[in-house]
């Protein structure tokens, strides 16, 4: 069946060194356990995180994300997942694409991450 992929409507903000969560879901909600679900970074499709065959797959994960990502899938039975990125870097800033794919259909959603320096303070006027 067909579905839409829905990500955050506004840019998500994170501080360097912190962790950040990027939510993504399908609508109408359905069990995504048997789907291929992932995040990649356009324009070169570098794999941030990939889930298939009921488990996380790190075979194609970009080196800069190795050991820094976790897919929160407690609600994957309802088509809801969240990507957690630990130890956020300035290089993480920019676009991410989340996709859900089953055997007959695929959709994706774009989202943006803004990374800020925790030590940069603007003094009050």
């Amino acid at each position: 069946g067909q579905f839409r992929v829905i990500g955050p409507r506004h840019p998500i903000r994170a501080l360097v060194g912190d962790e950040v969560e990027l939510p993504c879901r399908i609508s109408p909600g359905k069990n995504a356990t048997g789907m291929e679900v992932g995040w990649y970074r356009p324009p070169f499709s570098r794999v941030v995180h990939l889930y298939r065959n009921g488990k996380d797959q790190d075979g194609d994960q970009a080196p800069e994300y190795r050991g820094r990502t976790e897919l929160l899938k407690d609600a994957i039975g309802e088509g809801k997942v969240t990507l957690r990125i630990r130890n956020v870097r300035f290089s993480d800033e920019g676009g991410f694409t989340c996709f859900f794919r089953d055997h007959s259909y695929q959709e994706e959603a774009a989202m943006e991450l803004k990374v800020e320096d925790p030590f940069y303070w603007v003094s009050p006027g």
Epitope: G38, S45, N53, G54, G59, R101, Q106
Partner: antibody
């Protein structure tokens, strides 16, 4: 309608090279991993190689690793298999197959008609 | 590598028969298994994926079952068009795949 059309097969001597092509149409080519699967005369199916939708990741069977190279040109909707150091045991019909996944190897929902590669002196 | 073993290698049956083909994996592959039909001189055709999901356009007389290491393809009432060779394929491995050796269903 999804169509996959292989070409480039033929007779080649042992140690020789051949380049197979697969022209794809009827689907968003760059969104799907693609594979080559071969079938020796009178034998079963053997997966040979695969490539991710973007072309950034490639995968090979041990029997062809180091001799065969898979690639794709998403601007031309075409899949390739460069075969070097060919052996008699590489003789087979080579099928191009569309996967349902973007990365890695899954099941194949569309296949081409195949192209015959014969390695013989 | 995961090995796939099909049985029987050849099966003789008549139109209307219920036919069952078995596929065993050398290690657990959960439900990540596909079945294909191939006729002489033609490309394989996907019938079943994820062990039991029927591919779009495939007649409902075909069904798949099983999980772990043992799987079956069943044709509830064999039709003239079903005489062919059937292959199972494990899709559990992320970066490779393997097929069974095939089961030829021939006319008794």
């Amino acid at each position: 309608e999804v169509q996959l059309l292989e070409s480039g097969g033929g007779l080649v001597q042992p140690g020789g090279s051949l380049r197979l092509s697969c022209a794809a149409s009827g689907f968003t080519f760059s969104s799907y991993a693609m594979s080559w699967v071969r079938q020796a005369p009178g034998k079963g199916l053997e997966w040979v190689s695969a490539i991710s939708g973007s072309g950034g990741s490639t995968y090979y069977a041990d029997s062809v690793k180091g001799r065969f190279t898979i690639s794709r040109d998403n601007s031309k909707n075409t899949l390739y298999l460069q075969m070097n150091s060919l052996r008699a045991e590489d003789t087979a019909v080579y099928y191009c197959a569309k996967d349902w996944v973007y990365f890695g190897v899954g099941s194949f929902d569309y296949w081409g008609q195949g192209t015959l590669v014969t390695v013989s002196s | 590598d995961i090995q796939m073993t099909q049985s029987p290698s050849t099966l003789s049956a008549s139109v209307g028969d219920r036919v069952t083909i078995t596929c065993r994996a050398s290690q657990s592959i959960s439900s990540w298994l596909a079945w294909y039909q191939q006729k002489p001189g033609k490309a394989p055709k996907l019938l079943i994926y994820d062990a039991s999901s029927l591919e779009s356009g495939v007649p409902s007389r075909f069904s798949g079952s099983g999980s772990g290491t043992e799987f079956t393809l069943t044709i509830s009432s064999l039709q003239p068009d079903d005489f062919a060779t059937y292959y199972c394929q494990q899709t559990h491995s992320y970066s490779s795949t393997t097929f069974g050796q095939g089961t030829k269903v021939e006319i008794k």
